[in-house]
């Protein structure tokens, strides 16, 4: 399927130009999306181009500025949050990034009713997390690892926890590993629906080994960054969940929620918390060996002021073929009866589908089915369930939004997005207002992204929120590469691939091939999305063919493919990239002597192993911030797929799957190894060990480090990185500069 039509008129082609590296580094062809900040069923907030915060009412068609850009500018605010009673806005400034999601900031409260900032009992700085209650204008915030509560912004704070300590005890915020690998949030506290209770997690990292690395900065002596970071097999954080009554916080204080007995019997994780009502909460727990998950529904006991989690309200989810869930264990979406819920998990055929659980998981009613996967449940209302899947036309890399009518019997299914802008839009997400009265659809491609507003009852499009007209105009004179998404059938395995072809692609000619790989468990690279990025430039200007292949271990094509890599990372992911390359060579337009592979993070691991596979297929390759041994990576992630690095578990494969073990095999390839020295995620240690092994084996290679840069290699490092990699590839492919 050719997703980007080539332009055929010669007169047009003369005025058109190829993409430049500068275009990419400057973000010239970046797109915009529009996600309404919903504040009711029919109202949303949006920050206008001139930085005013504007409230839009869909039904009246009216809009007005609720917060002036003058106010935003007076505190250099980069973000805002309106209290549910609409009386206050918090303004966030002095943003200081910590890890992937976490950051600290200074918060100011603006009183909308009085038209001024709140003075008195001001918030301390910097704050680690702050949020409004779901009703009214209570504030919960985390400062120096402790949680505080304010009944009103101008009131003195009530301190909920007192044991918070840097790198030791975390209250209301996750430690490093929970943030990155379990919660995927900067917070670990949750208001009940009407703000009566506040639940929070306490993480005790006292016994966790610490990763230490130098941060060079500008001082005479570098400083040392210390992070409690459990690597595979190491001591893990100890988690406890507490709930406090925010109306009378001093009355009984925080009450601990009991852990299910079958979970508490060995090392375990807390995976998520979902409030059902003000007096019912659902907690999800996971054994350290991550194939057993327990969903526990707990009720408030007024008489004892405690939380009761009866065994009859424990639901077990177990995988016999891999780990529990996909990347994470899915979260429940409760229905209006406040006890039954909808949840995505594997059906008997090994495809992730929506199930309705009323009493037990064994009696779950399957809502969706087929050789495709349900991906996300967006919203459940009294009569409809909205979800996304990759069912349409059997393309796993698409996302369409569906509505199932659950109010009628039998339930009927309707694809909301499949035929809206079929050529332009095949990959959607959605954002719903209260009660799904209205929703926004955000289409990511394959054409230029577009965001639209829709009526939640009729699905009628109301208006276009963002259509990227400037981008469309800017691209009119650009020779974009052609993209196609197809599949290879090899030994009963389907390998979907995306091929990016030079604008004047001619099948009778030979082109250099670059494989871009990620390949991590439950990832997906072959997606029908729009992008003008580095590989677009390599195809457009440098005449390369770029291919992305989803092999075994990747997501949304069933458990057989997903769990194939269970307990043996680094084998099939690499094999499948190699198999695909061989198939591409058979297509006749690839120059066999000019094939390269590159990847970042997990992709750096796969590209390194592919280069060291001894096949002779690859002339050169690049690994950016690669994992080199699973013993060096985080426990939560690694053990999910690999088990423990112990003799009686999976130590042997931990040892066999390192990049260092294959150092000798790099002798006949050109290898560029790149890493940031301040990578908190995939530690520089990984590349240091690869480099040491290559030196010890007397194998020549190229390397680049980025001082004080983390896993993202951002800012000026990005420009340097892509320029450097471009030179490396052009040299490898004998392309003139």
């Amino acid at each position: 399927i050719v997703l980007r039509p080539s332009r055929v008129h010669n007169s047009e082609e003369n005025t058109m130009r190829a993409l430049t590296l500068k275009d990419i580094l400057n973000g010239t062809f970046s797109y915009k999306t529009f996600f309404p900040n919903w504040i009711s069923g029919q109202e949303y907030l949006h920050q206008s181009a001139d930085n005013n915060i504007v409230l839009y009412n869909i039904e009246t068609g009216q809009s007005y500025t609720i917060l002036s850009n003058r106010t935003m500018k007076s505190v250099n605010a980069s973000n805002y949050g309106l209290s549910p009673d609409r009386q206050f806005v918090y303004l966030e400034s002095d943003y200081s990034k910590l890890w992937r999601y976490s950051y600290t900031a200074t918060y100011y409260i603006y009183d909308l009713s009085n038209g001024e900032f709140v003075r008195g009992n001001e918030l301390p700085r910097p704050i680690q997390y702050l949020c409004w209650s779901p009703v009214g204008s209570k504030l919960a915030y985390v400062y120096q690892n402790n949680i505080y509560l304010k009944q009103r912004p101008g009131d003195p704070p009530f301190q909920i926890t007192f044991n918070g300590r840097e790198n030791k005890i975390f209250n209301g915020i996750p430690d490093w590993v929970y943030e990155e690998e379990m919660l995927a949030t900067k917070y670990a506290l949750w208001w009940s629906p009407n703000g009566k209770f506040l639940a929070y997690a306490e993480f005790n990292d006292t016994d966790i080994p610490v990763i230490a690395y130098s941060y060079y900065g500008d001082e005479q002596y570098p400083r040392t960054i210390n992070i409690p970071y459990p690597k595979a097999g190491a001591k893990n954080p100890v988690v406890r969940i507490f709930i406090i009554d925010t109306t009378y916080p001093a009355y009984v204080g925080p009450q601990e929620v009991p852990v299910p007995a079958m979970i508490a019997s060995s090392d375990y994780y807390f995976s998520w918390l979902t409030w059902v009502t003000d007096e019912r909460v659902c907690l999800q727990w996971l054994k350290r060996v991550q194939n057993v998950s327990v969903l526990s529904i707990c009720d408030f006991r007024e008489d004892w002021q405690t939380w009761d989690c009866p065994k009859t309200q424990e639901h077990i989810e177990e995988s016999r073929t891999g780990w529990a869930g996909g990347f994470f264990v899915s979260t429940p979406v409760f229905s209006y009866d406040a006890i039954s819920y909808y949840k995505i998990f594997s059906d008997k055929d090994g495809y992730k589908h929506i199930h309705y659980i009323k009493d037990t998981v064994e009696n779950a009613i399957q809502i969706t089915s087929g050789k495709w996967e349900a991906i996300n449940i967006f919203r459940v209302t009294q009569d409809s369930l909205f979800y996304s899947s990759n069912e349409f036309e059997e393309y796993p890399g698409r996302r369409n939004i569906y509505r199932i009518s659950i109010g009628s019997y039998p339930p009927s299914k309707k694809c909301v997005t499949c035929h809206l802008r079929k050529e332009r839009c095949q990959y959607y997400t959605a954002s719903f207002s209260d009660y799904a009265k209205y929703y926004a659809l955000v289409c990511y491609g394959p054409g230029i992204p577009i965001s639209t507003l829709h009526d939640g009852r009729t699905d009628q499009e109301i208006k276009i929120l963002e259509e990227n007209k400037e981008l469309e105009n800017a691209l009119k004179n650009i020779q974009l590469p052609k993209e196609e998404i197809k599949k290879l059938e090899v030994d009963e395995i389907t390998l979907w691939y995306k091929m990016i072809l030079p604008p004047q692609f001619d099948r009778s000619k030979k082109y250099p091939l670059l494989i871009q790989v990620y390949g991590g468990p439950c990832s997906q690279s072959v997606r029908s999305v729009f992008a003008v990025n580095w590989i677009s430039y390599l195809a457009s200007k440098e005449g390369m063919v770029i291919a992305l292949v989803d092999g075994r271990g990747t997501a949304f094509q069933g458990d057989k493919l997903l769990y194939a890599v269970y307990r043996k990372l680094g084998v099939y992911e690499v094999e499948d990239q190699i198999t695909a390359v061989r198939k591409f060579i058979e297509m006749g337009f690839i120059d066999e002597k000019r094939i390269a592979i590159w990847g970042w993070s997990y992709g750096g691991y796969v590209s390194s192993l592919a280069l060291a596979s001894g096949t002779g297929l690859f002339k050169c390759g690049i690994a950016v911030a690669p994992v080199s041994s699973w013993e060096y990576y985080a426990s939560v992630y690694t053990e999910r797929f690999m088990g423990l690095p112990t003799k009686d578990d999976n130590l042997e494969h931990y040892k066999n799957s390192t990049v260092m073990a294959r150092a000798e095999y790099f002798r006949n390839v050109d290898y560029l190894l790149i890493h940031g020295t301040a990578d908190d995620n995939v530690h520089f240690q990984n590349s240091a060990q690869i480099a040491k092994a290559l030196v010890n084996a007397q194998v020549d290679f190229q390397a680049m480090w980025y001082s004080d840069q983390n896993h993202g290699l951002s800012g000026l490092s990005t420009n340097h990185l892509y320029t450097h990699m471009t030179h490396f590839l052009k040299q490898c492919f004998s392309l003139s500069d």
Epitope: T65, I66, T71, S74, N114, R119
Partner: antibody, heavy 124, light 113 residues
Framework: QVQLVQSGAEVKKPGASVKVSCKTS????????IHWVRQAPGQRLEWIGG????????NYNQKFKGRVTITVDTSASTAYMELSSLRSEDTAVYYC?????????????????WGQGTLVTVSS | DIVMTQSPDSLAVSLGERATINCKSS????????????LAWYQQKPGQPPKLLIF???TRESGVPDRFSGSGFGTDFTLTISSLQAEDVAVYYC?????????FGQGTKVEIK
């Protein structure tokens, strides 16, 4: 000259409601919040509440919460204060006053112009 | 709530003499980040609404005679009429606008001795 003109005196029975208006002119209505202050005979001035005309969001003194409703009609540049469940101790002169909106963090303003006052008498 | 207490309750001063009114707040009205005190002084004559004289504790409202001055910071404030005139006979109120609810002092009645 800035003007805040209030509605006339009212006599009400206990348990009834009263609605006082405050018509403003000769300034940009949306640049100022409107506040209501009362003064019972021989008593100090007492703040009842205020409203921001830009968004219609009121803020009430907890003492009056549940009994007072402050609204605005931006098109008429007029603010209203309604007090319900009147009792004899609500007998007072009720004033509206304007207060400049503080857009900036380093701002904060006093009430610079006041209405002439409306006498509300609560008597059976 | 911030409680405002004025002293004296009433004051009789000869024409041309200095009149001094004190106002004490139950908590500081000094906004440290701005170094501004959120205190205002009003003058109210019989049958009239209050009139703003001073804001930010010491800044005179435009059109207010310079015989009126305000001073103080934190919790203790003073309004001074340097040379009392006949038209200055009125009740004077201090008011804090540091936080809500806005509160006023009980008032000081200034008369001519």
């Amino acid at each position: 000259q800035v003007q805040l003109v209030q509605s006339g005196a009212e006599v009400k029975k206990p348990g009834a409601s009263v609605k006082v208006s405050c018509k403003t002119s000769r300034y940009t209505f949306t640049e100022y919040t409107i506040h209501w202050v009362r003064q019972a005979p021989g008593q100090r001035l007492e703040w009842i509440g205020g409203i921001n005309p830009n968004n219609g969001i009121p803020n009430y003194n907890q003492k009056f919460k549940g009994r007072v409703t402050i609204t605005v009609d931006t098109s008429a540049s007029t603010a209203y204060m309604e007090l319900s469940s009147l009792r004899s101790e609500d007998t007072a002169v009720y004033y509206c006053a304007r207060r400049r909106i503080a857009y900036g963090y380093d701002e904060g303003h006093a009430m610079d112009y006041w209405g002439q006052g409306t006498l509300v008498t609560v008597s059976s | 709530d911030i409680v405002m207490t004025q002293s004296p309750d009433s004051l009789a001063v000869s024409l041309g003499e200095r009149a001094t009114i004190n106002c004490k707040s139950s908590q500081s009205l000094l906004y440290s980040r701005q170094q501004k005190n959120y205190l205002a002084w009003y003058q109210q004559k019989p049958g009239q609404p209050p009139k703003l004289l001073i804001f930010w504790a010491s800044t005179r409202e435009s059109g207010v005679p310079d015989r009126f001055s305000g001073s103080g910071f934190g919790t203790d404030f003073t309004l001074t009429i340097s040379s009392l005139q006949a038209e200055d006979v009125a009740v004077y109120y201090c008011q804090q606008y540091f936080s809500y609810p806005l509160t006023f002092g009980q008032g000081t009645k200034v008369e001519i001795k």
